[in-house]
């Protein structure tokens, strides 16, 4: 059995029927299903254009997936009175392309937010801070799931994704208190060097299916809670020694680097020697080599430095075209 | 398929000790680092402690230190929890867990878990 990160309950759902009369704090709102006893509702695929204004005072789960909102608004779940009581916030698949600042604002108790699978052409700085002060009010976010929200090409704004990702997540320094942080598939080149200090209380961090290169400019010194690391199926062709020290200057880390180019020259004598006397990589045993072509599928850990050469560059004079 | 099979618990009184062991079979064990998690009657999962692919290394969390110890046997595919100086407050079901790769990919791999009372 495998456990995910969040789960929908089994209660009983009360579907609800387009209604004349004003809404009742605890009524469900139509083109959703509600449960009380599981603090649960649920307006799934249903293709709606915004978010309901009815919802009951009592949600704590809510799951808005598979619709069409297009445009999360500033306020866009604030209430009078506010919904208190939501911590758990799904609106993955929902076709949004624009994430406006204070769209999250008024919602106190909100733990886990869900944005995956959304072509997000447009996420405010203000998105999660909902301040634009240097220094806003701390987040109650533990869990931010932001996999796969990266738009299509034509989509995209002048700005560098990774760096209107990154503003988001480091803006009033609001996700101080963030411990899980989803990045998977996204096309990152490259990750904007200052953000993981502004997140120092990050426990799991998944950065898998993505373009990384290389982490010679990110630094994981602060993340001294950091439990998991994900990089696999990444661009990467070497982890050099400054971020092999911090990697295992880290107490509780797992690091998983399956699926990536690793390059087996000489710049990759340091690491095979560190992941043989490293507990920190999870499946260490299964990383090979891609590059070059006389080294691929060679097990790292089974390399020795006689296998780990550089061809010698030639001076301009003799090389050839 | 990953299984993990967790044993060992059962009724005690306080001061008392326990073993409990968590069989493991569908991946290799011996390449990743495992824990042990719990959670009390109306309360969320808590960690309890973690072990390196060898076993070289521990940790606990706070509220177990000094009276839990985490180990493994590679050649078993098992991992062991011991338990002494039990407290009421220890009173919970015990999971073993398995973290394989992104959680939202279904990786994050938990046993039915066994239940630990401490009561005299």
């Known amino acids: 059995t495998s456990s995910a990160s969040s789960s929908s309950s089994s209660a009983p759902f009360l579907a609800s029927a387009a209604s004349a009369q004003p809404p009742l704090p605890d009524q469900c709102p139509a083109l959703c299903e509600c449960s009380e006893a599981a603090r649960t509702v649920k307006c799934v695929n249903r293709n709606l254009t915004e978010v309901p204004t009815d919802l009951p005072l009592y949600v704590r789960n809510l799951f808005l997936t598979g619709n069409q909102l297009a445009v999360l608004p500033a306020g866009a779940f604030a209430r009078r009175p506010p919904l208190a009581e939501l911590a758990a916030l799904n609106l993955s698949g929902s076709r949004l392309d624009e994430v406006r600042g204070g769209a999250f604002e008024h919602l106190p108790s909100l733990r886990q937010l869900d944005l995956s699978h959304n072509p997000l052409a447009y996420l405010s700085p203000f998105a999660f801070s909902g301040s634009n002060a240097s220094i806003s009010a701390p987040s109650p976010l533990v869990e931010l799931i932001l996999n796969h929200i990266v738009p299509p090409d034509d989509k995209r704004q002048n700005r560098s994704f990774e760096g209107m990702v990154a503003a988001a997540l480091v803006a009033g320094r609001a996700l101080q208190g963030l411990h899980l942080l989803e990045l998977a598939s996204n096309h990152f080149l490259y990750l904007p060097r200052d953000v993981l200090a502004q997140l120092p209380s990050l426990r799991y961090l998944d950065l898998s299916n993505n373009s990384l290169v290389s982490l010679t400019y990110v630094s994981f010194r602060n993340l001294t809670h950091l439990e998991s690391l994900h990089l696999e199926d990444n661009a990467l062709k070497v982890l050099h020694n400054g971020t092999l020290a911090e990697l295992q200057g880290l107490p509780h880390v797992r690091v998983f680097l399956d699926n990536n180019p690793w390059v087996c020259d000489c710049h990759m004598a340091d690491m095979v020697t560190w992941l043989k006397q490293t507990g920190v990589v999870q499946g260490k045993d299964r990383l090979t080599c891609a590059f070059p072509e006389k080294m691929r599928n060679r097990v790292l850990l089974e390399l020795n430095s006689a296998d780990l050469d550089c061809d010698p560059i030639l001076p301009p004079s003799l090389q050839t075209s | 398929e990953v299984q993990l099979v967790e044993s060992g618990g059962g009724l005690v009184q306080p001061g008392g000790s326990l073993r409990l062991s968590c069989a493991a079979s569908?991946?290799?064990?011996?390449?990743?680092?495992m824990s042990w998690v719990r959670q009390a009657p109306g309360k969320e999962r808590e960690w309890v402690a973690s072990?390196?692919?060898?076993?070289?290394?521990?940790r606990y969390a706070d509220s177990v230190k000094g009276r839990f110890t985490i180990s493994r046997d590679n050649a078993k595919n098992t991992l062991y929890l011991q338990m002494n100086s039990l407290r009421a407050e220890d009173t919970a079901v015990y999971y073993c867990?398995?973290?394989?790769?992104?959680?939202?990919?279904?990786?994050?791999?938990w046993g039915q878990g066994t239940l630990v009372t401490v009561s005299s």
């Open positions: 867990n398995a973290e394989l790769g992104p959680r939202r990919l279904g990786m994050d791999y």
């Open positions: 569908g991946f290799t064990f011996s390449s990743y680092a």
């Open positions: 072990i390196t692919t060898a076993g070289g290394s521990t």
